[in-house]
């Protein structure tokens, strides 16, 4: 269809904030459960600890986690799982001070990736019981369809 | 031409990952050589240590480098060279811990800039023999034409 | 109207760099005054310490501040004020080394948000007399209308 000025600008977007974060007893990871704070378009679906891609294409993905942890390095890994395989897209790493009063760092990263229909995107902190700050303006995850 | 729904969304994009990193003897810098991991459109061309702009316009540029170095501050400078002059676009700076086991930080930055046809974009670490982690999900460079 | 190939790509963008930074005597904050370095479109207006939204919509916002300060944690808060209320959109936090020679960190964050006509966007450092580096490639603020 011919595009109107209004249609032209409608990139699908999704900005998510945390509901909670949990660690499985048998794995050295902490996962974040997400809820939408801003949504435009129907191509992305928050689903527990992941986001399901319903509309394949090229996306700008961004992730920030706010850490309050004295573990020497902290960070998050953004991965996609689909078509029987898992792939790390990008990660953020931050060295942390050893003193609890100073151990306070946000870690932001982003990139452009091709996502397939049915992919599940997730943010994993490769530490059991990682101490995160789940404030919606400190820890978040987002997608823009390009 | 009238745009179809598909044409509407075709921002040119380029996401690059490292091939290697080298230092010049006569300059206190480390440069990264790039290869495309994702490409859409023909307006950008990876070219050794730089990216050549073939299609002028406004771009979102992003850069991340993963440092494993005890030098007290590390970081990268994203510059463009063209029309006989060089210009720093943005830079990322990270203080590093002095203990090698803790000296592990990614540094991400991004911004929107007008790039000219023929410009060469490069990422320089203003340290000779900087210790980088060249994992494709830790160190990368990207462009989105807006 | 039917869009031409050229019209299709005209996202409004604004990239701002600092003019100066000041602290009010009666408040524990430092504010940055901004000037445009790149502008496309008329929907955003730099206005002293803030940016006025003239064209409502969904925007990618990004902010970086370069800190040279030994205060144990530094960072910036990006907020919008409008319709009688203030809302924090996102923040960046960085632990700083205690030694002045090492206390050198950029803090970058970004996200996608719905902004309303008349909103005033600002970047606040919640520290009086924060030591910032106001280099235009170290401290900046940007908007892309999606």
């Amino acid at each position: 269809a011919v595009l109107t000025q209004k249609q032209k600008k409608q990139h699908s977007v999704l900005h998510l904030v945390p509901i909670n974060a949990t660690s499985k007893d048998d794995s050295d990871v902490t996962e974040v459960m997400w809820q939408p704070a801003l949504r435009r378009g129907r191509g992305l679906q928050a689903q527990g600890y992941g986001v399901r891609i319903q509309d394949a294409g090229v996306y700008l993905l961004y992730s920030q986690v706010l850490f309050q942890d004295v573990t020497f390095t902290m960070g998050q890994v953004v991965s996609r799982e689909g078509q029987g395989r898992q792939e790390t897209l990008f990660r953020c790493i931050r060295s942390m001070p050893s003193h609890p009063d100073r151990a306070y760092n946000s870690c932001y990263s982003a990139g452009v990736f091709h996502l397939h229909q049915g992919d599940i995107l997730s943010v994993i902190i490769p530490r059991a019981r990682a101490k995160l700050n789940l404030s919606p303006h400190g820890t978040f995850l987002g997608f823009v369809k390009l | 031409a009238v745009l179809t729904q598909k044409q509407k969304k075709q921002h040119s994009v380029l996401h690059l990952v490292p091939i290697n990193a080298t230092s010049k003897d006569d300059s206190d810098v480390t440069e990264v050589m790039w290869q495309p991991a994702l490409r859409r459109g023909r307006g950008l061309q990876a070219q050794g240590y730089g990216v050549r702009i073939q299609d002028a316009g406004v771009y979102l540029l992003y850069s991340q480098v993963l440092f494993q170095d005890v030098t007290f501050t590390m970081g990268q400078v994203v510059s463009r060279e063209g029309q006989g002059r060089q210009e720093t676009l943005f830079r990322c700076i990270r203080s590093m811990p002095s203990h090698p086991d803790r000296a592990y930080n990614s540094c991400y930055s991004a911004g929107v800039f007008h790039l000219h046809q023929g410009d060469i974009l490069s990422v320089i670490i203003p340290r000779a023999r900087a210790k980088l982690n060249l994992s494709p999900h830790g160190t990368f460079l990207g462009f989105v034409k807006l | 109207a039917v869009l031409t190939q050229k019209q299709k790509k005209q996202h409004s963008v604004l990239h701002l760099v600092p003019i100066n930074a000041t602290s009010k005597d009666d408040s524990d904050v430092t504010e940055v005054m901004w000037q445009p370095a790149l502008r496309r479109g008329r929907g955003l207006q730099a206005q002293g310490y803030g940016v006025r939204i003239q064209d409502a919509g969904v925007y990618l916002l990004y902010s970086q501040v370069l800190f040279q300060d030994v205060t144990f944690t530094m960072g910036q808060v990006v907020s919008r004020e409008g319709q009688g209320r203030q809302e924090t959109l996102f923040r960046c936090i960085r632990s700083m080394p205690s030694h002045p020679d090492r206390a050198y960190n950029s803090c970058y964050s970004a996200g996608v948000f719905h902004l309303h006509q008349g909103d005033i966007l600002s970047v606040i450092i919640p520290r009086a007399r924060a030591k910032l580096n106001l280099s235009p490639h170290g401290t900046f603020l940007g908007f892309v209308k999606l």
């Epitope: - | 230092s23 003897d25 006569d26 300059s27 206190d28 030098t71 007290f72 501050t73 970081g75 720093t88 700076i93 203003p126 340290r127 000779a128 023999r129 | 760099v17 600092p18 040279q68 020679d101 050198y104 030591k131 910032l132 580096n133 106001l134 280099s135 235009p136 170290g138 401290t139």
Partner: antibody
Framework: QVQLVQSGAEVKKPGASVKVSCKAS????????MHWVRQAPGQGLEWMGY????????KYNEKFKGRVTMTSDKSASTAYMELSSLRSDDTAVYYC??????????????WGQGTTVTVSS | DIVMTQSPSTLSASVGDRVTITCKAS??????VAWYQQKPGKAPKLLIS???NRDSGVPSRFSGSGSGTEFTLTISSLQPDDFATYFC?????????FGQGTKLEIK
């Protein structure tokens, strides 16, 4: 306390080379770069470049590339600046000055006393 | 290269006067500007860094201000020891560059 002590005055003929030394004390030599700045008689200051003793890497002002060589000796906490193919307009006082390890964005906080180099036939 | 233009080139003043020296950069250098004092036959001495930060041991009568392209060094009340030449310098981008200097002399 921080001190930078430079070598003595030199008189050289055109076409010759000169090597100036700068011995540092009172701080960790490898944590700071050493800048070299010159000042012609009655003139202003001109930045020539720096040497980073941490990795023995120089950064030169393009104007001097090909003629200047900056080196350092960590064991002696000493930086060196050698200028070749000397001309009469290289007659100047040459200063070393300490800058922080991430050289950009930091001023030069301590300076040597200067070394006078005279180029004359 | 960034050009740093200092004015005036010479300034005559008396003890107790308030004096201001200005420096204009040919492009935006943020607040990455230093001011140095130099006396005849001596090395420059750092007074101000980051446009406004007094170095340790520098008297409070010296102050710096500005960002972007316009910078000022102010001496609030001249003392006999202040008669010297003053240089500004940008260290935002290579090559680092200096102003041509302002000679402050006794009126």
């Amino acid at each position: 306390q921080v001190q930078l002590v430079q070598s003595g005055a030199e008189v050289k003929k055109p076409g010759a080379s000169v090597k100036v030394s700068c011995k540092a004390s009172g701080y960790t030599f490898t944590s700071y770069v050493m800048h070299w700045v010159r000042q012609a008689p009655g003139q202003g200051l001109e930045w020539m470049g720096y040497i980073n003793p941490y990795n023995d890497a120089p950064k030169y002002n393009e104007k001097f590339k090909g003629r200047v060589t900056m080196t350092s000796d960590k064991s002696a906490s000493t930086a060196y600046m050698e200028l070749s193919s000397l001309r009469s307009d290289d007659t100047a006082v040459y200063y070393c000055a300490r800058g922080l390890g991430y050289a950009l964005y930091y001023a030069m906080d301590y300076w040597g006393q200067g070394t006078t180099v005279t180029v004359s036939s | 290269d960034i050009v740093m233009t200092q004015s005036p080139s010479t300034l005559s003043a008396s003890v107790g006067d308030r004096v201001t020296i200005t420096c204009k950069a040919s492009q935006n250098v943020g607040n990455n500007v230093a001011w140095y004092q130099q006396k005849p036959g001596k090395a420059p001495k750092l007074l101000i860094s980051s446009a406004s930060n007094r170095d340790s041991g520098v008297p409070s009568r010296f102050s710096g201000s500005g960002s972007g392209t316009e910078f000022t060094l102010t001496i609030s009340s001249l003392q006999p020891d202040d008669f010297a030449t003053y240089f500004c310098q940008q260290y935002n981008i290579y090559p680092f560059t200096f102003g041509q200097g302002t000679k402050l002399e006794i009126k």
